[in-house]
Interface confidence: medium
């Protein structure tokens, strides 16, 4: 399987909400022996590998923000810890996997990584990640709502979080 980032850059005004999204695609084994662990973290663009270093998002580690389920099942973080920090990660039946950040501040700007680990019990773990940039802007140059720039083309799209 692979992970695709729908957008490589999100530009948002301060105070807005944004949902960063990754999609898992390709063959997904739905057997009892296979589960998926999905999470988010902040990182930096390393010289060797992007998303190598795992930094917290608003003081929450990748362990705090994880989802764990079998196949393309729906799941979301319901624990108070994430919600107290204005965060919620979710996964749907179609392989979409997202994190919603509420009330953005300039400190939220940076590189965000989604991580998916396919766990085949008694055999192996296969892990892949996707990366995207979030720029939070303030002042007259800031957009009125979030603008997302697709990974594969230059056309932008206005988005708002639920």
């Amino acid at each position: 399987f692979k992970v695709a980032t729908l957008y490589s850059l999100y530009v948002c005004p301060e105070g807005q909400n944004v949902t960063l999204t990754c999609r898992v695609f390709g063959p997904v084994d739905k057997g009892h022996d296979v589960t998926f662990y999905k999470t988010w973290y902040r990182s930096s663009r390393g010289e060797v590998q992007t998303c190598s270093e795992r930094r917290p998002i608003r003081n929450l580690t990748f362990q705090d923000l994880h989802l764990h389920h079998g196949g393309h099942q729906a799941a979301n973080t319901s624990h108070d810890l994430a919600q107290r920090h204005g965060l919620e990660s979710a996964s749907d039946h179609h392989g979409n996997f997202s994190i919603t950040m509420r009330n953005l501040t300039l400190l939220d700007s940076g590189l965000y990584c989604c991580l998916v680990v396919e766990i085949r019990h008694h055999h192996s773990e296969h892990r892949v990640h996707g990366a995207m940039e979030l720029q939070v802007q303030t002042g007259k140059d800031a957009p009125s709502s979030c603008v997302a720039y697709p990974s594969s083309s230059q056309e932008s799209e206005n988005i708002t979080a639920a």
């Epitope: 362990q63 764990h68 766990i119």
Partner: antibody, heavy 118, light 106 residues
Framework: EVQLQQSGPELVKPGASMKISCKAS????????MNWVKQSHVKNLEWIGL????????SYNQKFKGKATLTVDKSSSTAYMELLSLTSEDSAVYYC???????????WGQGTSVTVSS | QIVLTQSPAIMSASPGEKVTMTCSAS?????MYWYQQKPGSSPRLLIY???NLASGVPLRFSGSGSGTSYSLTISRMEAEDAATYYC?????????FGSGTKLEIK
Amino acid sequence: EVQLQQSGPELVKPGASMKISCKASGFSFTGYTMNWVKQSHVKNLEWIGLISPYNGGTSYNQKFKGKATLTVDKSSSTAYMELLSLTSEDSAVYYCARRAYGYAMDYWGQGTSVTVSS
Amino acid sequence: QIVLTQSPAIMSASPGEKVTMTCSASSSVSYMYWYQQKPGSSPRLLIYDTSNLASGVPLRFSGSGSGTSYSLTISRMEAEDAATYYCQQWSSYPFTFGSGTKLEIK
């Protein structure tokens, strides 16, 4: 504060069985796997196996199948390892350690010393 | 199973000296992890994903490598670094550790 508190040292007779406990606190128990590691003078560190409190799934090092049985009690956030038919080769320090998938064992218990002797 | 061979088995270094130890895997692994253990204590995570420092680990520690060859470096040896260091792989079951490198202070 993340803590893994293991049960105390054990002196057991050959052929007997015993159970070590590992009580977790300070984190979401079901968000990690609980791993068990054996440390003896002969073999240094050996991974015994893991259990996922999320779904009770286990994975064992083939070498320890039939020797170790891993279980969890989610209600008390406690992991257990039962060691069966003990021999002198099972004398060692046993550690529990938590691990998030795709990561490493970032917190370890203090270790439980097991001595098998008649 | 993947066998991890660490070398040297024992080494000593003076304070301020640069220290490098290696871990060789019998088959290619995606990432390497390093742990430090002092006598009477539990292992402590030092390096994850080959080159990233775990929380609270001093910047004098670094990791590198790929495929079957990995290394752990201490840029300037300090007395508190005297310990045994283990490499470990999570790429395939059963997960395995190296036999350890014991680092002593001169």
